[in-house]
Amino acid sequence: SERCDDWGLDTMRQIQVFEDEPARIKCPLFEHFLKFNYSTAHSAGLTLIWYWTRQDRDLEEPINFRLPENRISKEKDVLWFRPTLLNDTGNYTCMLRNTTYCSKVAFPLEVVQKDSCFNSPMKLPVHKLYIEYGIQRITCPNVDGYFPSSVKPTITWYMGCYKIQNFNNVIPEGMNLSFLIALISNNGNYTCVVTYPENGRTFHLTRTLTVKVVGSPKNAVPPVIHSPNDHVVYEKEPGEELLIPCTVYFSFLMDSRNEVWWTIDGKKPDDITIDVTINESISHSRTEDETRTQILSIKKVTSEDLKRSYVCHARSAKGEVAKAAKVKQKVPAPRYTVELACGFGAT
């Protein structure tokens, strides 16, 4: 067969679908690899061909579009399963071609099973809600295109195993779930089961997402440097190890990049010749406020090092702050007996 532009196996799009539920899978060629859409390709005389390789097999085979009740079908650039079976798991390829052009991409499809509480190997999207922020909503995800707007599905919401009914601050409103005032206790997995009719059959779609209640922007503050501070002086003798922690608290801010760095005499540690190591650790509160600690370490400090300026800097979307550490050379204790003897004129 003639050459085909092969985009390989697109593992970035690991598609997971539930067993015994409908699934619609768009050919990734038009979404991520080609600069034109299916309609343009179709009107230019290009044909979209689908085939697959079963799990643990090497053999590429055509997809059987003649199954009872059209269980698998193709519509434009979408491959439909109505519904999926466990053994539909495998690598699927869509190929766009005519006599002079060919382009193809493969992607993995995994059909997964869920338990009685909707737990499964499915990777879950995370939706962040601000704590005590007023009404916020989540929407049942990835159900577009399954049924026309004329069809009114029923939607049932669950938190973990339990149907959401008579919850104090969580109200199902069709495709949306409203949180009147989000609290830490609202953290968890939420599932919507969407039921809709199609061609004399009833189908169900199950979608689970994780809700994480995070710090509110109303309470967000610029970074706070807890250490170094004015109360601690790092007094060292030459030859000793100098350890200075920089501990910074960051309020949770959606999509904010939190940064902590040290400067020594106004330069980044990488830009100076002394032997400095910096170790970072990060911890999070229940609302995803972040505490970052960077420990600056000089194994054998010199008297020159003890004269330098050590400044901890921190930055978030809320602002930038800096704090200098108080570093000084320890004054050696007087050798008391000798000095006394000298004082009395002893030789």
């Epitope: 466990l86 869920k114 039921t195």
Partner: antibody
């Protein structure tokens, strides 16, 4: 298409136990709940409980907690209900019925008639 | 347990009559009520769920309505094949409970 095929009628002595089966086909047995419902003439329908074959999780109607035991065998796509310490009150038609997490029953078995004799 | 009180118990009908069956829940069940039809010697068949949603394949002469505690099931024009027992069921909470049934019989 979905089918639930139940075992045949049973005539058993008072005090004994019985096991009724329900074989499912046409859908993913592991991924839906299987319910059991009792029907006595003039007594309407009573929900006994349900089992999720995928993980064996069960919910019972408190009234039947000590009477019925629900199990499932994924390899044969069959659900079972064992009824113990039988009395004449247990004489009834028993149905298995599927639900997809939603507590209403879209497919039913044909029913198994249990007669308890003294 | 939620008690579902269904009325009437018996309903004499003639072909093409409009039929209304009611079901009252002992507490609020939102709109989570299903309706079933059972013919002699057969298993029940799902007709409606979530009070007003017709199950696939169910003719549109069957409709349902209601929320909270009061629910109505209507057959707009009864056909001979509709002679059966009809049950309501709350699918709001466990234990699931049914109404006692309404038997449609010829006048």
């Amino acid at each position: 298409q979905v089918q639930l095929q139940q075992s045949g009628p049973e005539l058993v002595k008072s005090g004994a136990s019985v096991r009724i089966s329900c074989k499912a086909s046409g859908y993913a047995f592991s991924g839906s709940w299987m319910n059991w419902v009792k029907q006595r003439p003039g007594k309407g329908l009573e929900w006994i409980g349900r089992i999720y074959p995928g993980d064996g999780n069960t919910n019972y109607n408190g009234k039947f907690k000590d009477k019925a035991t629900l199990t499932a065998d994924k390899s044969s796509s069959t659900a079972f209900m064992q009824l113990s310490s039988l009395t004449s009150e247990d004489s009834a038609v028993y149905f298995c019925a599927r639900d997809y997490y939603l507590f209403y029953f879209d497919y039913w078995g044909q029913g198994t008639t249990l007669t308890v004799s003294s | 347990n939620i008690v579902m009180t269904q009325t009437p118990k018996f309903l004499p009908v003639a072909a093409e009559d409009r039929v209304i069956i009611t079901c009252k829940a002992s507490q609020d069940v939102s709109n989570e009520v299903a309706w079933y039809q059972q013919k002699p010697g057969q298993s029940p068949k799902l007709l409606m769920y979530y009070a007003s949603n017709r199950y696939t394949g169910v003719p549109d002469r069957f409709t349902g309505s209601g929320s909270g505690t009061d629910f109505t099931f209507t057959i707009s024009s009864v056909q001979v094949e509709d002679l059966a027992v009809y049950f309501c069921q709350q699918h709001y909470s466990s234990p699931l409970t049914f109404g006692a049934g309404t038997k449609l019989e010829l006048k």
